[in-house]
């Protein structure tokens, strides 16, 4: 999916008002210095591509974040403010319903959510030069 035409300001507002808080809640009890940011993004569409990948694609050691509150809100924001995004999720939703229902917080998941926090922060500062 190409995130170029999303309403970035409305997605940013949703992040600042609610998604950011859910990410913090998920990470509660973890030191902010515990994980190094290894995933980066260069512009807003690229950031959303990386955010979608880390949020919804299972990785080794972190089977699924998709049922977490921050993920549900991310999905809603993309569906509402990214043209044509919702139709790409019709089959993905069916697959998610069949997926394992239990929510397990592993160290790998914490690391992944820490990366997500970095990507979202970068998304909110699009004019900063890439380090």
């Amino acid at each position: 999916y190409d995130f170029t035409n999303c309403d970035f300001e409305k997605i940013k507002a949703a992040y600042l008002s609610t998604i950011s808080k859910d990410l913090i809640t998920y990470m509660s009890g973890t030191k902010s210095t515990e994980f190094n940011n290894t995933v980066s993004c260069s512009n807003r569409p690229h950031c959303l591509t990386e955010i979608q990948s880390l949020t919804f694609n299972p990785t080794a050691g972190c089977a699924s974040l998709a049922k977490e509150m921050f993920a549900m809100k991310t999905k809603a924001a993309l569906a509402i403010w990214c043209p044509g995004y919702s139709e790409t999720q019709i089959n993905a939703t069916q697959a998610m319903k069949k997926a394992r229902k239990s929510k397990v917080t592993t160290n790998k998941c914490l690391e992944q959510v820490s990366q997500l926090q970095g990507l979202w922060r970068r998304f909110n500062r699009p004019l900063l030069k890439q380090q």
């Epitope: 949703a14 008002s17 549900m72 809100k73 809603a76 569906a79 509402i80 044509g84 019709i90």
Partner: antibody
Framework: QVQLVQSGPEVKKPGSSVKVSCKAS????????MHWVRQRPGQGLEWMGT????????DYNQNFKGRATITADKSTSTAYMELSSLRSEDTAVYYC?????????????WGQGTLVTVSS | EIVLTQSPGTLSLSPGERATLSCRAS??????VHWYQQKPGEAPRLLIY???QSISGIPDRFSGSGSGTDFTLTISRLESEDFAVYYC?????????FGTGTKVEIK
């Protein structure tokens, strides 16, 4: 079963405001956005805006920006649409309709409609 | 804003006949089109979503097709209860918009 029950008909004077309610039941309120659509007599359907409980935010059709305010009370699963500075052209049936925001993504259930008549 | 134009405005047919309703978008919207039926004094009812997906409880004589800018709703054999107004809607991008409507009336 899913039900959206709207408030009763209203007769309003030009320049005044109207607030229409839509009480939802039979599903998890925060899993769906609540959209408002209006239909003038003998005309087609016009999307006004939406409230997304999951994100606690609204979005509007620019044609109604500044005049329409869409809110919700999550504790009672009730959505509201307030339209101000009413004029005769606002005489219409106003519908609420739910739409999944993390699945389905379509207006699959509608309220019965509320007729708002604006007349001096 | 994406404009949806429906044609014809009115379709006069007899029960048992096939109805073909068209919806054209002002720009490509992939498959983000849904079809609704509305009878006088009633709220719209969802018939087809995302161009061709069927809804449980909707008779299988209703089918949808198309992608990009051209979409079609087909009613294979009209029943008496099918005479109504039909609207297409796009949810590709905000503001969501509806088509102008096609009235299917008894000939």
């Amino acid at each position: 079963q899913v039900q959206l029950v709207q408030s009763g008909p209203e007769v309003k004077k030009p320049g005044s405001s109207v607030k229409v309610s839509c009480k939802a039941s039979g599903y998890i309120f925060t899993d769906y956005a609540m959209h408002w659509v209006r239909q003038r007599p003998g005309q087609g359907l016009e999307w006004m805006g939406t409230f997304i409980p999951l994100l606690d935010t609204s979005d509007y059709n620019q044609n109604f920006k500044g005049r329409a305010t869409i809110t919700a009370d999550k504790s009672t699963s009730t959505a509201y649409m307030e339209l101000s500075s009413l004029r005769s052209e606002d005489t219409a049936v106003y519908y609420c309709a739910r739409m999944g925001v993390t699945h389905s993504y379509v207006m699959d259930a509608w309220g019965q409609g509320t007729l708002v008549t604006v007349s001096s | 804003e994406i404009v949806l134009t429906q044609s014809p405005g009115t379709l006069s047919l007899s029960p048992g006949e096939r109805a073909t309703l068209s919806c054209r978008a002002s720009q490509p919207i992939s498959i983000s089109v849904h079809w609704y039926q509305q009878k006088p004094g009633e709220a719209p009812r969802l018939l087809i979503y995302f161009a061709s997906q069927s809804i449980s409880g909707i008779p299988d004589r209703f089918s949808g097709s198309g992608s990009g800018t051209d979409f079609t709703l087909t009613i294979s054999r009209l029943e008496s209860e099918d005479f109504a107004v039909y609207y297409c809607q796009q949810t590709f991008s905000l503001p969501y918009t509806f088509g102008t409507g096609t009235k299917v009336e008894i000939k």
